[in-house]
């Protein structure tokens, strides 16, 4: 092996370099010293390093490592943060439009039910929003409350408009009768099925994105161990002690060091891969009754159909309820008052066909494609960091942690480091507690994503057919039956025009590699197209 170059007789170069790291401190020896107190940069001869310098190098090395890690994840982090914000806002917009469509349906078709209907609709969609954001609300209860509240108003305003105000105390009885007599047929159950499935999926999709951000934030701010600090110092700074200022570490050596330093982080890889693949599966299944946009924007139509169903049976209902709620305090309604031929009218649901342009689902698929390019993010981190820090190309004339070599030999490097500490031992240590915690969270979300993955083919609960629905002209899959389009209904020409309204507040100019981002006003649906340009 070549002899080491003659050391800097005055340590002048080392001093001027170190001055940049720690201005004004006189820790650099004037001339090379034996360095017997050094613990990391063990000298083979006179050295220009002191113990204090070594400590400073270790601190700097660990900071460098944290910065490299943060820059490695910047693109991925931005991708998930921006999409989480955009989707949350988009879902809010869907909810708002669904509420407005439903209110408009009441205003146009049943003005006598307003403003009470606005209240029930408003409360329902408020709960929908809260549920999506993670509130502990039961979807079936939300739907039941909507219909429980609606029926007394339908009964008193539509079916018996002449009822005096004094009869308002029958409301409680009417609420109970609504369920017992199934006055809306199977529409409440249909809505429960559609809303619960679509909202559950939406909620877990948002949860998964937010967990993705948490994973990146956790690994972004990892504090590296002292052992790792020593390895990094040896790789990046010990050459300076010998006056070798321009020497770069060997590439192979860098990989070994990084794998040692990042052994814990790399353990995330398996669960991260599963996370992205499970998220992809979830997204692939987010259509029809598993697509909140499709379900919620069609709700006004299903609610309209449910009220028409009540009106069809108004005569029989009025008679039955007249008996049931005559003495409302007793609330003695029972099946004895329930004529068997009531409510057997089978409802044929019609599809509200929608002309899709730029949809949330295409936006979701686009996100998954981008995320898949980061599927090996954690396993590739050591290599990525080495390729983004100074290393010698082709391992020629490079630093192996102890000396300048012509070619890097992992075996020689390991042998040479035996007395300092064992690289293998470092790799065998378990992951840090924070990494273990994030792995547990990933396992949990992966489990949820797997259980949420939708069955292929016939998705709607089969028992809906048995309870009075026919597929009719709905097509082959019952889950297409999102609702009809009664007279005076709002035509949902394009479900997704509203996406033009979507404005997100992340400072897009700060996006890495993105300087010409259009604003959402530049074209009607630019928000989503432009997002595709952000990496």
């Amino acid at each position: 092996q070549p002899p080491p170059p003659p050391p800097d007789a005055t340590c002048h170069q080392v001093r001027s370099f170190f001055q940049r790291l720690q201005p004004g401190l006189k820790w650099v020896p004037e001339t090379p010293v034996p360095g017997s107190d050094l613990q990391v940069c063990l000298p083979k001869g006179p050295t220009c390093c002191s113990r204090k310098m070594e400590e400073k190098y270790q601190l700097t090395a660990r900071l460098n490592m944290e910065q490299l890690l943060q820059s490695a994840s910047m693109e991925l982090k931005f991708l998930i943060i921006q999409n989480a914000a955009v989707f949350q806002e988009a879902f809010e917009i869907v909810v708002r439009h669904a509420k407005n469509y439903t209110n408009a349906m009441f205003k146009n078709n049943y003005p006598s039910l307003t403003p009470q209907a606005f209240e029930f609709v408003g409360e329902f969609f408020t709960d929908v929003s809260l549920y999506i954001l993670g509130s502990d609300i039961n979807v079936d209860d939300m739907v039941n409350e909507l219909f429980d509240s609606l029926f007394p108003v339908i009964y008193t305003q539509l079916m018996n408009p002449g009822l005096p105000d004094s009869a308002l105390d029958i409301n409680e009885c009417l609420r109970g009768a609504r369920r017992d007599l199934k006055v809306f047929g199977n529409f409440p159950k249909l809505i429960m099925t559609q809303v619960s499935k679509s909202l559950q999926v939406t909620r877990i999709f948002l949860q998964a994105l937010n967990l993705g951000i948490e994973v990146i934030n956790t690994t972004d701010h990892l504090k590296f161990s002292k052992d790792c600090g020593r390895m990094l110092t040896r790789m990046w700074y010990c050459s300076y002690c010998q006056g070798l200022m321009m020497v770069k570490p060997c590439g192979g050596y860098c990989n070994v060091v990084m794998q040692g330093c990042m052994a814990g982080v790399v353990e995330i890889d398996k669960y991260w891969r599963e996370y992205i693949l499970s998220l992809e599966e979830l997204v692939n299944g987010m259509y029809r009754i598993y697509d909140m946009e499709n379900v919620l924007l069609g709700l006004f139509s299903t609610i309209h159909d449910s009220i028409q169903y009540v009106q069809k049976n108004a005569g029989k209902l009025t008679t039955t309820i007249g008996k049931l709620c005559a003495h409302s305090q007793q609330r003695q309604y029972r099946s004895a008052y329930y004529p068997e031929d009531l409510f057997i009218d089978k409802k044929v649901l019609k599809v509200a066909h929608v002309e899709h342009e730029e949809t949330l689902s295409s936006r979701r698929r686009e996100l998954i494609q981008k995320l898949k390019s980061f599927i090996s993010f954690y396993s590739a981190l050591p290599g990525y960091i080495c390729s983004h820090s100074p290393v010698a190309e082709n391992d020629t004339l490079c630093w192996n942690g102890q000396e300048l070599v012509e070619r890097y030999s992992q075996k020689a490097a390991r042998n040479g480091m035996k007395n300092q500490f064992n690289l293998h031992e470092l790799k065998m240590k378990g992951p840090e507690p924070v990494v273990s915690q994030i792995i547990d969270k990933l396992k949990h979300i992966n489990q949820l994503l797997r259980t949420m993955s939708m069955p292929k083919g016939r998705v709607l609960d089969k028992n809906l057919d048995e309870e009075g629905f026919e597929s009719g002209d709905c097509g082959d899959d019952e889950d297409e039956c999102i609702g009809g389009s009664g007279d005076g209904m709002i035509k949902v020409k394009n479900q997704l025009r509203f996406l033009a309204e979507l404005a997100y507040d992340l400072d897009v100019d700060d996006a890495p590699g993105n300087s010409q981002q259009a604003t959402p006003k530049d074209n009607e649906i630019s928000t989503f197209h432009n997002l595709g340009n952000v990496h």
Partner: antibody, heavy 119, light 107 residues
């Protein structure tokens, strides 16, 4: 004309109780969600409580939960706020306000009534 | 809960001038934002709902804009009766919250 007329404010010692009333006229009271909103002297507005038309949904701000009770009598077109275990920080002007669900806003307000909690 | 921050705290202007009041939410509130005017000793009065719709009887000089987290109330030409405190309020998330208010005073 649509209006909300309030009564029942006054001076009360810490730990004491007070009942506020709000009488509605000019609109079908039983069709609307009603609220109480308060404003401490020289401060901003703070939502306190909410009751929907059929009394099936009732909500409270964390600061008053367990101490205040909202209720309504649709036949009497009246809204009430029963305030127990009053604290100094409950000192404020209390407004009753109608919530308009289509607009998603408080569209009609009472004139306000002062509640002073002091020993 | 969502925090609404209004700026400036005080705006000193002369009648006829244009007033621009800002309201920023700590997270997106979509367009569920309303603006109220309150004069001393009076109850608040609804001016704008759903970020940009004028309430019944509100003069055209009042206009609202914005969505997501940034909202603006503009009074195109101040009238003497417009000098008051203005509050923004969100209903996107429970509970409904108000901003701390912007006082528009005569310069």
């Amino acid at each position: 004309q649509v209006q909300l007329v309030q009564s029942g404010g006054g001076l009360v010692q810490p730990g004491g109780s007070l009942r506020l009333s709000c009488a509605a006229s000019g609109f079908t009271f039983s069709h609307y969600t009603m609220n109480w909103v308060r404003q401490a002297p020289g401060k901003g507005l703070e939502w306190v409580s909410y009751i929907n038309s059929g009394r099936s949904t009732i909500k409270y701000a964390d600061s008053v939960k367990g101490r205040f009770t909202i209720s309504r009598d649709n036949a009497k077109k009246s809204l009430y706020l029963q305030m127990n275990s009053l604290r100094d920080e409950d000192t404020a002007v209390y407004f009753c306000a109608r919530w308009e669900w289509e607009q998603e806003a408080f569209d009609i307000w009472g004139q306000g009534t002062m509640v002073t909690v002091s020993s | 809960e969502i925090v609404l921050t209004q700026s400036p705290a005080t705006l000193s202007l002369s009648p006829g001038e244009r007033a621009t009041l800002s309201c920023r939410a700590s997270q997106s509130v979509s367009s569920y934002l309303a603006w109220y005017q309150q004069k001393p000793g009076q109850a608040p009065r609804l001016l704008i709902y759903d970020a940009s719709n004028r309430a019944t009887g509100i003069p055209a000089r009042f206009s609202g804009s914005g969505s997501g987290t940034d909202f603006t109330l503009t009074i195109s030409s101040l009238e003497p009766e417009d000098f008051a405190v203005y509050y923004c309020q969100q209903r996107s998330n429970w509970p409904p919250t108000f901003g701390q208010g912007t006082k528009v005073e005569i310069k």
